[in-house]
């Protein structure tokens, strides 16, 4: 999902946190979409 950044050591060291953040934001987006859907 971030091919070029993988050459940076930082990407490797933060990978777990990045994945956590992505999962969280996907959850938040899904919840937001649900709220929007429910209000229609």
């Amino acid at each position: 999902d971030n091919p070029s950044l993988s050459i940076d050591l930082t990407f490797h060291l933060l990978r777990t946190l990045l994945e956590l953040a992505r999962t969280q934001s996907q959850r938040e987006r899904a919840e937001q979409n649900r709220i929007i859907f429910d209000s229609v």
């Epitope: 070029s4 950044l5 050591l9 930082t10 990407f11 933060l14």
Partner: antibody, heavy 118, light 112 residues
């Protein structure tokens, strides 16, 4: 060659905000995270946070969370660090830095002195 | 946070003689990938820091071979085999294995 050129020195009043810029050249800006480190006069180095210029992911040192905002402008290959609610203890030289595939802070900007004084 | 403690605070040296700086971490800084992300930086007066050593013992490009790093777990050392005038300044150890990333307090290498 990799170059990180920072904005000039600033003098601010307590309570104000400051925005420091860091213009990158000599490499593909979106290939490397940008970090910010500060150094109070005569003191050691303190990591403030890191931003992914590609996706915008940001990780702040908890110590600065809520007061620091890191952003990038991909069109100009420039990273920004804004610190709000300034106090005298924020008087420091602020550095941007970039890593490599092997180390976290391989290239550094020249530093920006921010003086907070009433 | 991982506290990085450097000793001595100041190291008075004679040019041409060796110097040694110690860095101790408050907990193991072996990353979950089995690497130890311990780096050493040199800062000359009025300049930004400069990377010397990464992953405990690897010299960064352009760093003279009189600089060497060693150690494991929580105890690390930076050695300068023969100090030259251009080596004077402050040296910092740094750990990147645990967030927040932390630096040691610095060791000033100065002329005796």
């Amino acid at each position: 060659q990799v170059q990180l050129v920072q904005s000039g020195a600033e003098v601010k009043k307590p309570g104000a905000s400051v925005k420091v810029s860091c213009k990158a050249s000599g490499y593909t800006f979106t290939d490397y995270f940008m970090k910010w480190v500060r150094q109070a006069p005569g003191q050691g180095l303190e990591w403030m946070g890191v931003i992914n210029p590609n996706q915008g992911d940001i990780f702040y040192n908890q110590k600065f969370k809520g007061r620091v905002t890191m952003t990038v402008d991909k069109s100009t290959s420039t990273a920004y660090m804004e610190l709000s609610s300034l106090r005298s203890e924020d008087t420091a030289v602020y550095y941007c830095a970039r890593g490599t595939d092997r180390a976290l802070f391989a290239y550094w900007g020249q530093g920006t002195l921010v003086t907070v004084s009433s | 946070d991982v506290v990085m403690t450097q000793t001595p605070l100041s190291s008075p040296v004679t040019l041409g003689q060796p110097a040694s700086i110690s860095c101790r971490s408050g907990q193991s800084i072996v990353h979950s990938d089995a690497n130890t992300y311990l780096e050493w930086y040199q800062q000359r007066p009025g300049q930004p820091p400069r990377l010397l050593i990464y992953k405990v013992s690897n010299r960064f490009s352009g760093v003279p071979d009189r600089f060497s790093g060693s150690g494991a777990g929580t105890d690390f050392t930076l050695k300068i085999s023969r100090v030259e005038a251009e080596d004077l300044g402050v040296y910092y150890c740094f750990q990147g294995s645990h967030i927040p990333w932390t630096f040691g307090g610095g060791t000033k290498v100065e002329i005796k």
